[in-house]
């Protein structure tokens, strides 16, 4: 039985040309973490396999960098990187656990941080 | 296009070192992590180890630890295999391969390297 | 290490048989299992990864399925410069092991 929770930052903003760190956090849980996959909508943005360490998908080398943690750090944000964000745990024995964190590019200076909250 | 181009066949006595290049063009070297990988005669295929060529982080399989070194040049965007104490067990095909870009699999390989060892 | 067991080791078919090669691991590893044509003296080629995907180039005569640890590389029409030897391979964790290959002759 799958007990676990993911936390995620949740809702955030950020400034176009600056930069982000999305996180997750799996609780609850006595589960190994094996892998994470952080995914744009559909596209991958990077992996980070407990064995092998850190994949960072090469259209997005020059702009994500690895952590913190298991953690994924957006760099030079444009508009068109406002969208969803997934977290997706692969444990053992568990199986998949996924958090969404929403992320708007604002073109001023009025960005803001979210609210952290939890999916189950 | 994708080429990955190895360097020639080597012939190594026991105990010594071997070191093999792969030269990588039509892509960005450094967007991509770089892997060895080796086949026996008649053999099947063993994983020796993973190198990121932007930080020079690298990830070996155990059973290579300590014998293996993976470098890069990235001024000539040339991954190096470096394998120490050669044993007759040695005796194989080496292959860079190049990783995917949605994973560890590995989607564009050298052409091989034999590497002899006998005394 | 998950064990990886690829079935048959080798097989005989006719040009325009349907072929089926199993790959089984003994852990859960999600659909991060790839597949490898291999012809003598040659470097392998990727086929499919990610279980399913195709690799660039590749017919569609070749499909991937499977997930957890149960994986299968179908071609459905053999065709003459398809026999060869065909790998599995998970790409979930060190060691990134392969399977023991698959060696498809004319029957």
């Known amino acids: 039985m799958m007990t676990g929770t993911i936390e995620t930052t949740g809702n955030i903003s950020a400034e176009k040309g600056g930069s982000i760190i999305l996180q997750c956090h799996l609780s609850s849980t006595t589960a190994q973490v094996t892998q994470v996959n952080w995914e744009q909508q559909d596209q991958l943005l990077a992996i980070c396999n407990a064995d092998l360490g850190w994949h960072i998908s090469p259209s997005f080398k020059d702009r994500v960098a690895p952590g913190p943690g298991l953690g994924l750090t957006l760099q030079s944000l444009t508009v068109n990187d406002t969208g969803e964000y997934f977290c997706i745990y692969h444990t053992y024995p568990d199986g998949t656990y996924t958090g969404r964190i929403f992320l708007e590019v604002l073109e001023s200076s009025v960005a803001e941080h979210g609210a952290r909250f939890q999916i189950p | 296009e994708v080429q990955l181009v190895q360097s020639g066949a080597e012939v190594k006595k026991p105990g010594a070192s071997v070191k093999v290049s792969c030269k990588a063009s039509?892509?960005?070297?450094?967007?991509?992590?770089m892997h060895w990988v080796r086949q026996a005669p008649g053999q099947g295929l063993e994983w020796i180890g993973r190198?990121?060529?932007?930080?020079?982080?690298?990830k070996y399989n155990d059973n290579f630890k300590g014998r293996a070194t993976l470098t890069v040049d990235k001024s000539t965007s040339t991954a190096y295999m470096e394998l120490s104490s050669l044993r007759s067990e040695d005796t194989a095909v080496y292959y860079c391969?190049?990783?995917?870009?949605?994973?560890?699999?590995?989607?564009?390989w050298g052409q091989g390297t034999t590497v002899t060892v006998s005394s | 290490d998950i064990q990886m067991t690829q079935s048959p080791s080798s097989l005989s078919a006719s040009v325009g048989d349907r072929v089926t090669i199993t790959c089984r691991t003994s852990?859960?590893?999600?659909?991060?299992l790839a597949w490898y044509q291999q012809k003598p003296g040659k470097a392998p080629k990727l086929l499919i990864y990610?279980?399913?995907t195709f690799a660039e180039g590749v017919p569609s005569r070749f499909s991937g399925s499977g997930s957890g640890t149960d994986f299968t590389l179908t071609i459905s029409s053999l065709q003459p410069e398809d026999f060869a030897t065909y790998y599995c391979?998970?790409?979930?964790?060190?060691?990134?092991?392969f399977g023991q290959g698959t060696k498809l002759e004319i029957k």
């Open positions: 391979q998970h790409h979930y964790g060190i060691p990134l092991p």
């Open positions: 852990e859960n590893i999600f659909t991060y």
């Open positions: 039509g892509y960005t070297f450094t967007n991509y992590y």
């Open positions: 391969a190049r990783e995917g870009g949605f994973g560890y699999y590995f989607d564009y």
């Open positions: 190198i990121d060529p932007t930080s020079g982080a690298t």
């Open positions: 990610n279980a399913k």
